[in-house]
């Protein structure tokens, strides 16, 4: 086109329905120019106008010839243009922010605007740019894009933004623009102009100077604090550490904390100082609640449920910022809240939930919540299977009879629908405890009763009880212990009895042992001893306990002696023993040696012995009657170990084995023995009976049994040349090759002739006795042989 004609035709649209086309007027034309615009399309349309732009309906795809005639005072000129949608620019109208508001407590800006979508013929994607600026100098803080869709009608859009800096700290400005990304439009698409700016600023009050106030934030976060001040701020500190100041408008300043550390329970202090003042706030840096750990629900009484949990990682937030817990039961919709005053015991928290009638299965959700977040744990529980009974109380023991008692106790709760398994601990003094399990039907009134049999009469028992439900979850704690003495019963056995004839053979001495407590069945008060023959029964006077011996004058006829023990309830069965022994001519005295503490005696089985065997023992050196103690063993035994605290090593004891038939005893074996053999304590006394020029006859005496201290096994006789009171070596000293030793193993030998000696020579003689326990001391003598004749 010529310069003298209309030129530079451009078309724009803001709604895709109308194109706004404008051109530049020919140079030199004034105001009074008219234009004729003709558009060559299906119907040839021409428009008369007095300005350099025209709004035309959007043309469909394809090229169109546009003719513009300019009619002015000094003639006319015509320009032809080819117009295509691709030459048209889509520039949306400048958007307008309808509303900008702020929530200062969360430092959040809220934006509201209209997309004016009703003017667009079809759906289009819209890109919005939102610009946030801060401070009077309008520093760009954030530029964000936000996508929406036009849907043929006007739509209100909302957008919010959380500021990293409290909104109180500085003025904040917001402006928006848009870009319509229409798929149906092939022309150039451009951004709208920026909307008129809107701002938010804080109206300072007289008090608060530092923001944010009392904020709770996550450990590791970044946070900005500011101080609104009329006077110059000199410094800022978090805790005791200084922070560089960021200058805002006027005297206002800010600081930025990166990766904040966990706070103490009193929070972290943030302060700003001026010449004369300090302004501060407290920040609480902590953690959201951890998932409650080990959530467990149980009941003590089937009336209320106790749920316990561990809070897990500490949040570092206390007081009003501490974690609050709510326990919700989803079947019933009921819930209970944890009161902060209920301080956790040993790091574990607990809540009580009232049980609901006819509900056994509970679905609990424990919600944990603090200002930084929430978490939860769930548990599904059949509460009848999670009964942890209270400790049984009011535990009592009452007698039924001498072998049975009645136990009663109190177990709070309504257990009518379940069974209990209770464990009773039964402890007898000085013996191991026994435990018995009993199943008991639960009751509503909390009182329980059980009978306990198979006890021993007159025995001190200590009882205690604990219970669990039959399905077993947990044992209750043990009840208090109750000590109880069962009542007496008739003694179950007669005393263990023996008899000995007195040394003069005129009196029979009857001995018996006190009944063990489990056979006495009570306190033994006395004993009855009676003596019967075919003709008569003679009863001695009652012998009070603790006397365990009676003496009867008897002839040598055979009598049956009976001993009966009596307690407050009655008399024992009689213990019977014949006064006379069944003779046995075929007896040798045997030697036996023990094993340090006791002595093992063995014998052959004898079917004739029908009652029992008795082993009797005594100290060999004691006078008659020989009785130190006796032991009864069953008739089917063939060995026993005899042990006694009275046994001493090196002391000789007599042991007698008796067999019994029809209450009569026959001596089967007679033994002498030692628990342990020792070496003799003395040497044999010896003398020289005869001396010649070449021999000496020595004679010695027996060592008394008490000093022998074992079975004599032989003598050691040493001899060699030697003189009294000289420096010459003694016979027993080592290294002498001329010493001769004789081992005399025939213990009946009491003399020894030493031959082949030299005449008129001094000899040193030494004699020692030995047992299996060792060699005894020496006895020595010096003898001079006669002169050769």
């Amino acid at each position: 086109q010529k310069k003298g004609a209309p030129h530079d035709l451009k078309c724009v649209t803001n709604n895709l329905q109308v194109w706004d086309c404008y051109w530049k007027a020919p140079s030199g034309t004034g105001r009074g120019t008219d234009y004729e615009v003709c558009i060559e399309n299906r119907s040839h349309s021409c428009y008369q106008l007095e300005k350099t732009n025209i709004k035309i309906p959007a043309l469909s795809h394809g090229d169109y010839e546009i003719t513009i005639n300019s009619l002015h005072d000094f003639g006319s000129s015509t320009s032809k243009f080819t117009l295509n949608e691709q030459n048209v620019s889509l520039i949306p109208d400048t958007p307008e922010i309808l509303n900008l508001s702020a929530d200062f407590s969360t430092s959040t800006l809220y934006l509201k605007w209209n997309d004016r979508g009703s003017v667009f013929p079809h759906h289009s994607n819209v890109i919005w740019e939102i610009k946030i600026l801060r401070k009077e100098s309008m520093e760009l803080v954030k530029l964000v894009t936000h996508n929406t869709t036009l849907n043929g009608k006007d739509t209100l859009h909302h957008w919010s933004w959380a500021s990293d800096m409290p909104l109180e700290c500085a003025i904040h400005f917001v402006e928006i623009r848009c870009y319509i990304d229409s798929l149906h439009f092939s022309g150039r698409k451009e951004w709208s102009d920026w909307s008129p700016v809107k701002n938010i600023s804080w109206m300072p009050d007289s008090q608060t100077k530092v923001f944010p106030q009392d904020k709770v934030i996550l450990v590791g976060s970044d946070i900005t604090f500011c101080c609104i001040s009329q006077e110059k701020v000199l410094s800022a500190l978090i805790g005791h550490t200084n922070c560089p100041l960021i200058h805002l408008d006027g005297e206002n300043v800010a600081i930025k904390i990166h990766n904040i550390s966990v706070s103490a329970s009193s929070g972290t202090n943030v302060v700003f100082t001026t010449e004369d003042n300090i302004f501060g706030t407290v920040i609480f840096a902590g953690y959201p609640p951890d998932t409650p750990q080990q959530l467990n629900c149980e009941t003590h009484d089937l009336k209320e449920i106790l749920c316990r949990w561990n809070p897990g990682r500490a949040t570092a937030l206390v007081g009003p910022r501490a974690t609050s817990y709510t326990l919700l039961e989803s079947f019933s919709g009921k819930y209970v809240r944890f009161k902060r005053a209920e301080a956790p015991t040993n790091g574990s928290y607990q809540l009580f939930f009232q049980m609901l009638p006819n509900q056994e299965i509970y679905n609990f959700t424990l919600n944990a919540h603090n200002p930084l977040g929430r978490s939860e744990s769930t548990i599904l529980v059949n509460i009848t299977e999670k009964v942890y009974p209270h400790t049984p109380t009011s535990f009592k023991v009452k007698d039924i009879n001498s072998t049975a008692v009645k136990l009663s106790w109190h177990l709070p709760g309504n257990f009518a629908k379940i069974n209990f398994l209770c464990q009773i601990e039964i402890k007898k003094s000085n013996t191991v405890q026994e435990q018995r399990n009993v199943t008991i039907k639960g009751v509503e009134n909390s009182s329980y009763l059980v009978a306990l049999d198979k006890l021993n009469p007159y025995t001190v028992y200590t009882f205690r009880i604990r219970c669990s439900t039959e399905t077993f979850w947990k044992w209750s704690k043990w009840s208090n212990k109750k000590q109880h003495l069962t009542t007496e019963a008739i003694p179950s056995k007669g005393p263990d009895t023996w008899r000995e004839w007195s040394s003069d053979g005129k009196n029979l001495i009857i001995y018996w042992k006190p009944l063990p407590i489990n056979e006495a069945n009570g306190k033994i008060l006395s004993y009855n001893v009676s003596c019967s023959s075919d003709e008569e029964t003679q009863s001695l006077s009652e012998i009070p306990d603790p006397q365990h011996k009676a003496e009867i004058q008897l002839d040598k006829n055979d009598y049956i002696i009976s001993v009966v023990a009596k307690n407050s309830v009655g008399s024992s069965p009689p213990s019977k023993i014949a006064s006379m022994e069944i003779p046995n001519d075929d007896l040798k005295i045997e030697q036996v040696v023990g094993m340090g503490k006791g002595i093992l005696l063995t014998w052959h089985y004898d079917p004739n012995m029908t009652c029992d065997y008795v082993i009797k023992w005594c100290n060999s050196s004691r006078s008659e009657p020989c009785l130190m103690d006796w032991r009864k063993v069953p008739s089917n035994s063939t060995e026993t170990v005899i042990e006694s605290d009275q046994f001493r090593p090196g002391v000789r004891y007599n042991f007698f084995l008796y067999g019994c038939r029809n209450q009569g005893y026959q001596l089967l074996r007679s033994m002498i023995g030692y628990i342990e053999e020792l070496a003799p304590t003395v040497a044999p006394n010896f003398t020289v009976e005869d001396t010649s020029a070449d021999s000496i006859l020595v004679k010695w005496e027996d060592i008394p049994v008490e000093e022998l201290r074992g079975f004599l096994r032989g003598y050691l006789f040493y001899f060699g040349k030697g003189e009294r009171d000289t420096s010459k070596m003694r016979v027993l000293e080592s290294g002498r090759s001329d010493i001769k030793v004789k081992n005399i193993t025939d213990i009946s030998q009491k003399t020894l002739r030493i031959a082949d000696l030299q005449g008129k020579t001094s000899y040193h003689l030494v004699l020692r006795a030995y047992t299996d326990g060792g060699v005894g001391p020496e006895k020595s003598m010096y003898v001079v042989t006669k002169e050769n004749s």
Epitope: L234, L237, T241, N242, C243, D276, N277, I278
Partner: antibody
Framework: QVQLVESGGGVVQPGRSLRLSCAAS????????MHWVRQAPGKGLEWVAV????????YYADSVKGRFAISRDNSKNTLYLQMNSLRAEDTAIFYC?????????WGRGTLVTVSS | DIQMTQSPSTLSASVGDRVTITCRAS??????LAWYQQKPGKAPNLLMY???NLESGVPSRFSGSGSGTEFTLTITSLQPDDFASYYC?????????FGGGTKVEIK
């Protein structure tokens, strides 16, 4: 470990000068305001001077104003106190302490004796 | 300058006693008060700041209270390690000023 160690104390005549140093270790020295506090023998604590974390501000007690100068070298993690025109009443243990407002870490002190 | 007055200057007490030390400011200092402990021959040690905040590592038997001009330091159950001198300090404005000190000694 975190510590402050003072040095430079000693016996000096009245009217003379002395320079105290305080070496910091185990923490970010440049993030803390630093003080000098003194304690005359058998007496209480007396604040002497403070310097801002970046050295931008300094304040002094009236008793030392014009005679003492506090300074710091953050690159060397060191605090200084230049003491001029010393007087007998300046005799004290001088402590350096960390923290602009509250002193949460103290050195063991260095004794300055002003005596003729 | 803000003057700090501490009382008593000396206090005799036994292990297990509850001990209270008072500090007064000549003008309001809000809560900008610290307490220090000093043992003979040693440097002071920070116990409490902002009147009632316990410094990390300080036993919980120490507590502080007060605001404005009246402040107290309390030791609930005196331990052998607590026999020392105690100083209050205001840090509301420069110059920082200390109280005259309270010596807690064994009765």
């Amino acid at each position: 470990q975190v510590q402050l160690v003072e040095s430079g104390g000693g016996v000096v005549q009245p009217g003379r000068s002395l320079r105290l140093s305080c070496a910091a270790s185990g923490f970010t020295f440049s993030s803390y305001g630093m003080h000098w506090v003194r304690q005359a023998p058998g007496k209480g604590l007396e604040w002497v001077a403070v310097i801002w974390f970046d050295g931008s501000l300094k304040y002094y007690a009236d008793s030392v104003k014009g005679r003492f100068a506090i300074s710091r070298d953050n690159s060397k993690n060191t605090l200084y106190l230049q003491m001029n025109s010393l007087r007998a009443e300046d005799t004290a243990i001088f402590y350096c302490a960390r923290g602009q407002l509250v002193q949460d870490l103290w050195g063991r002190g260095t004794l300055v004796t002003v005596s003729s | 300058d803000i003057q700090m007055t501490q009382s008593p200057s000396t206090l005799s007490a036994s292990v297990g006693d509850r001990v209270t030390i008072t500090c007064r400011a000549s003008q309001s200092i809000s809560s900008w008060l610290a307490w220090y402990q000093q043992k003979p021959g040693k440097a002071p040690n920070l116990l409490m700041y902002k009147a009632s905040n316990l410094e990390s590592g300080v036993p919980s038997r120490f507590s502080g209270s007060g605001s404005g001009t009246e402040f107290t330091l309390t030791i609930t159950s005196l331990q052998p390690d607590d026999f020392a001198s105690y100083y209050c300090q205001q840090y509301k404005s420069n110059p920082l000023t200390f109280g005259g000190g309270t010596k807690v000694e064994i009765k």
